[in-house]
Amino acid sequence: CDLPQTHSLGNRRALILLAQMGRISPFSCLKDRHDFGFPQEEFDGNQFQKAQAISVLHEMIQQTFNLFSTKDSSATWEQSLLEKFSTELNQQLNDMEACVIQEVGVEETPLMNVDSILAVKKYFQRITLYLTEKKYSPCAWEVVRAEIMRSFSLSKIFQERLRRKE
């Protein structure tokens, strides 16, 4: 399963689409900056088996897909870019699911790292809570877009490390 290579390309395409989605000048949104507490430690460890690492990345992509699939998201972002972004994420999720099935036969370790997946879920809960508290304002979405771009960039480093381990 050559997921890290294909996923890295998909990740790059998703980042480009996210970058293109900006609607307002971020300079006007500085006061809305927020610490979402990205679970960096879940992407730092080398203790993961490949299937476990993929399951954490899968959760990250799934939560991002859910976040950008809401009606509030549809009301904020340009529709054609949003559709391309969702399609890209969906493709990545399908690739990952196929890869995990393939890897489970190879590895003896549990399929999922429950604590890491929970940490990712809680991270996205904090993002959703922030958007709710900010009443889904354009600046709140701009801050969230920047945060997701950052988390994608950080997970890309994780994927590259995973590829080097192979």
Epitope: A19, G22, S25, P26, F27, C29, K31, A146, R150
Partner: antibody, heavy 121, light 107 residues
Framework: EVQLVQSGAEVKKPGESLKISCKGS????????IGWVRQMPGKGLEWMGI????????AYSPSFQGQVTISADKSISTAYLQWSSLKASDTAMYYC??????????????WGQGTLVTVSS | DIQMTQSPSSLSASVGDRVTITCRAS??????LNWYQQKPGKAPKLLIY???SLQSGVPSRFSGSGSGTDFTLTISSLQPEDFATYYC?????????FGQGTKVEIK
């Protein structure tokens, strides 16, 4: 290792043009904004303006609006500060520094070494 | 623009002293405040961001506190290398603005 390397000292005459540079390395250049700060001899720090290299969106302090132009070339990870007509009062040390944009991370955590601009007839 | 006022503008202290510098904003900036140290001929160095978060690699004798309009930078036990000029900077809105600086000199 993150680095911002600025171009060397400049000595210019009033009325001349100038463009100084700030090259970023060791990080994703388009993931951070680049700000410019002036420090006149023996004085404090003055924020001039900022650029988002990902799309070259800029913002200026009212004190510097129309006096300088900030630009960037993301293909070579470099930001610029330029003057079309220098004045003696532009004599100062100019610093570039990176800013995390809307991300929650330390502001202006890395600085260039500074470019000394001297304007004298 | 948001005005930032530091006090004192200079102070004399001895090695081992506890030093406190204050910064006041002309309007609420929540906790969007940074502190920098600058030594002669050198670029500024970030010490504290978001009012109280210690920048990586900065000694723990430096600490920051405050929110709203009033902020404090404290050096718990002044070291020889701490003699420098310190600046606060608001980060809530453009244009970013700095305080006028506080020079910490040897007594």
């Amino acid at each position: 290792e993150v680095q911002l390397v600025q171009s060397g000292a400049e000595v210019k005459k009033p009325g001349e043009s100038l463009k100084i540079s700030c090259k970023g390395s060791g990080y994703s250049f388009t993931s951070y904004w680049i700000g410019w700060v002036r420090q006149m001899p023996g004085k404090g720090l003055e924020w001039m303006g900022i650029i988002d290299p990902s799309d070259s969106d800029t913002a200026y302090s009212p004190s510097f609006q129309g006096q300088v132009t900030i630009s960037a070339d993301k293909s070579i990870s470099t930001a610029y500060l330029q003057w079309s007509s220098l004045k003696a009062s532009d004599t100062a040390m100019y610093y570039c520094a990176r800013h995390p944009g809307l991300n929650w991370a330390p502001d202006f955590d890395y600085w260039g070494q500074g470019t000394l601009v001297t304007v004298s007839s | 623009d948001i005005q930032m006022t530091q006090s004192p503008s200079s102070l004399s202290a001895s090695v081992g002293d506890r030093v406190t510098i204050t910064c006041r904003a002309s309007q609420s900036i929540n906790r969007f405040l940074n502190w920098y140290q600058q030594k002669p001929g050198k670029a500024p160095k970030l010490l504290i961001y978001a009012a109280s978060s210690l920048q990586s690699g900065v000694p723990s004798r430096f600490s920051g506190s405050g929110s709203g309009t009033d902020f404090t930078l404290t050096i718990s036990s002044l070291q020889p290398e701490d003699f420098a000029t310190y600046y606060c900077q608001q980060a809530i809105d453009l244009p970013f603005t700095f305080g006028q600086g506080t020079k910490v000199e040897i007594k």
